[in-house]
Amino acid sequence: TQNKALPENVKYGIVLDAGSSHTSLYIYKWPAEKENDTGVVHQVEECRVKGPGISKFVQKVNEIGIYLTDCMERAREVIPRSQHQETPVYLGATAGMRLLRMESEELADRVLDVVERSLSNYPFDFQGARIITGQEEGAYGWITINYLLGKFSQKTRWFSIVPYETNNQETFGALDLGGASTQVTFVPQNQTIESPDNALQFRLYGKDYNVYTHSFLCYGKDQALWQKLAKDIQVASNEILRDPCFHPGYKKVVNVSDLYKTPCTKRFEMTLPFQQFEIQGIGNYQQCHQSILELFNTSYCPYSQCAFNGIFLPPLQGDFGAFSAFYFVMKFLNLTSEKVSQEKVTEMMKKFCAQPWEEIKTSYAGVKEKYLSEYCFSGTYILSLLLQGYHFTADSWEHIHFIGKIQGSDAGWTLGYMLNLTNMIPAEQPLSTPLSHSTYV
């Protein structure tokens, strides 16, 4: 008779990240008997849902079920059938839905209600869909990267198992850039967090952490672009907007109604003598940078120091992991290397933005034009946000690590969210148990 392999004693969890521009489903896996150990949970699958973010379904909620089908079916395939009923599913919606809720609580609830009904139809243990706060988004991103980097482990190692490891227990700060918001989260050095809204206290694995976090709604890369366009069209003399953030020769028609659809542009809204305008790219990094800086109000600060818009920001401390769109954009621009200085990044952005649109299209033929056209703006925005918004300098730039994955798991808030909801991050350091047969692999 053939020897049957012993069934793996593993558990799974699913988190859907319902972002402003798209939804992604993540499947996590961990050994059942090591639930409270640090660093044992890892991502086994990411499935990107085809289509826009869930907030865009506000006029077609009946299509949400179909929209989620492919990735939920993928989860059905990846996770063994015997585990389906005990696999928790969580959906967290971020800034796109926060913006919709600002517009209409009823519409936001309606979208979430249909999402919940759709996800309840699967054989998993559905735990609910909700709009997470910006503070949660920042905190869970910080937990994710530090968990994956082994920062919560009390064991010191003489060898490095993860990239960026400095072999100390100093946590990394987290920089997250989405389409509609951006988060900054870190442990300041012996600094009082002057605004209670930005202060978080954690006890993780027997250690206390006083964490600063803030989420800037409307300062994700897509909403920042809408803000910039709304600001700049105010002073345009006609329906042509010569825009330094787009490549020379680039042209695009924008509907004014689309521009003013988002709450993020309300402060710039005015009656315009036209229904449409045309963006004409002129590709000038310096002018683009200047235009972006006008989105940051640095004239008012009720604290010892601020980021922008009167939001408290303590002095930066330690290393930072910059992920999500920080990583995707910089990766596309080939600027994620630790060796590239801030001056070099700026230099390369100047060259990139100045390249003619026709040339760019030829060089990146496989990239969708909508995304391709916005890398000049996005790259410039990242530099502006990090340098002028968060006060990184040419010197402290080397402390920013552009991270896509750590140990095969995506950097982002979803893992931290699941670890928290499944109670897999103990407040106290777990007692060491006798070695089990699975301790050594």
Epitope: Q59, R101, M102, S104, E105, E106, L107, D109
Partner: antibody, heavy 114, light 110 residues
């Protein structure tokens, strides 16, 4: 279902709190709205409390009316400095634009008179 | 402030006839379609008939139809029945969680 309570006869200048008690659904996933109707008059929107706890009011109601979640099944409408013009039947509803079957309470009558 | 003007304030029609009620908003409703119609009878709370400007609430007869977009909306009641005698209200939803009711239209059935 939803049901209002707390309506009564009060004198001008009085403060009064009405309560909306819900059953069969979660307040953490629903908005609750308050609407009033003076005798023989039309419906008038007062405000809503969202599933997140955020509140929004009609311009005329700002300052004098406060909506708050007081438990997992109750939402209060606090009204201050009442005048005879506030005499009305006060309704609470689950949602507003999509308030379907059994989403509105029967109403509670508030009479402000000296 | 947002104004929702509902006309007429009162209308009378015979059984089997048709009644048309209009609502005009001083600004566009959210998504151009966030408008609902309610029916209210004396001593009762309002009852939802139509939402999203034209979607019939379940259980409501198809004699009730809603149309319109942006700032102009219409409720049409055809094949009028005695039971349709009531006051009808429109309700607009606006950006920023704002709402406004129309003044109401009393429908009398002869």
């Amino acid at each position: 279902s939803v049901e209002e309570s707390g309506g009564r006869l009060v004198t001008p200048g009085t403060h009064l709190t009405l309560t909306c008690t819900v059953s069969g659904f979660s307040l953490s996933k629903s908005i609750i709205s308050w609407v009033r109707q003076a005798p023989g008059k039309g419906l008038e929107y007062i405000g809503i409390i969202g599933s997140s706890g955020s509140t929004y009011y009609a311009n005329w109601a700002k300052g004098r009316f406060t909506i708050s979640k007081t438990s997992s099944t109750t939402v209060d409408l606090r009204m201050t400095s009442l005048t005879p013009e506030d005499t009305a039947t006060y309704f609470c509803a689950r949602g507003l634009l999509y308030s379907g079957n059994k989403s509105w309470g029967p109403g509670t009558l508030v009479t402000v008179s000296s | 402030a947002i104004d929702m003007t509902q006309t007429p304030s009162s209308v009378s029609a015979a059984v089997g006839g048709t009644v048309t009620i209009n609502c005009q908003s001083s600004q566009s409703v959210l998504l151009n379609n966030q408008l609902s119609w309610f029916q209210q009878k004396p001593g009762q709370p309002p009852k939802l008939l139509i939402y999203d400007a034209s979607t019939l609430e379940s259980g409501v007869p198809s004699r009730f139809t809603g149309s319109g977009s942006g700032t102009q909306f219409t409720l049409t009641i055809s094949d009028l029945e005695c039971d349709d005698a009531a006051t009808y209200y429109c309700l607009g939803g606006y950006s920023g969680n704002l709402y406004a009711f129309g003044g109401g239209t009393e429908v009398l059935v002869k």
